[in-house]
Amino acid sequence: MNGRVDYLVTEEEINLTRGPSGLGFNIVGGTDQQYVSNDSGIYVSRIKENGAAALDGRLQEGDKILSVNGQDLKNLLHQDAVDLFRNAGYAVSLRVQHRLQVQNGPIGHRGEGDPSG
């Protein structure tokens, strides 16, 4: 019997300072290239090693970015979203949605990593 997969969704405001090579992440999504079915939102697809986002540590691959400096990212073409980030200035405020997967196993199920027994 398989456990049910639930998601814990949280939101966070992340303030990044643009580094020498930029903000340090990649995005996917947009109205013209949906990354998630029926969702044209903008998602983080890669955190670059030693980039501003990686050094800050809060932004994660898979996070949905809801806004940049207060500007909503809904219904944007992919390239328009890229341009918005590129022109966001030195101090960049991101409103992000983290989606944490929570595995709910059946009662009495012991996970493989359970040290007991």
């Epitope: 090579s21 930029g22 990649n26 995005i27 998602y43 697809s45 670059k48 890229v82």
Partner: nanobody, 127 residues
Framework: EVQLVESGGGLVQAGASLRLSCAAS????????MAWFRQAPGKEREFVAE????????WYSDSVKGRFTISRDNAKNTVYLQMNNLKPEDTAVYYC?????????????????????WGQGTQVTVS
């Protein structure tokens, strides 16, 4: 091992055109970002143009926008740089560079530190 070989450089007069080619081998280059950089005598190497496969996105430096065009032929594993209305300040060694592209678009300007593989360069001189 990835190898890049540039060709097409030469000596031309201001206002002329040149087309540079970069032939790549050792990889499946439809899934690589490919770019041109240049280095003028006594200056640091600078970004010229990039073609990123994942979103069919091209970027240009402000100094070449409207004059240079980057394109690629994945069947031939070749990337081109069409340079029109050349100026003396375009004189430099032009390098082809590539890196394995990642999903999505970088929100940052292209940065040469991301590029894993470089050609030997081809000299362009505009008099």
């Amino acid at each position: 091992e990835v190898q890049l070989v540039e060709s097409g450089g030469g000596l031309v007069q201001a206002g002329a055109s040149l087309r540079l080619s970069c032939a790549a081998s050792g990889g499946t280059f439809s899934s690589y970002a490919m770019a041109w950089f240049r280095q003028a005598p006594g200056k640091e190497r600078e970004f010229v143009a990039e073609d990123s496969w994942s979103n069919h996105r091209v970027w240009y430096s402000d100094s070449v926008k409207g004059r240079f065009t980057i394109s690629r032929d994945n069947a031939k594993n070749t990337v081109y740089l069409q340079m029109n209305n050349l100026k003396p300040e375009d004189t430099a060694v032009y390098y082809c560079a590539t890196y394995r592209d990642y999903s999505g678009s970088t929100v940052d300007p292209p940065n040469q530190s991301e590029y894993d593989y470089w050609g030997q360069g081809t000299q362009v001189t505009v008099s």
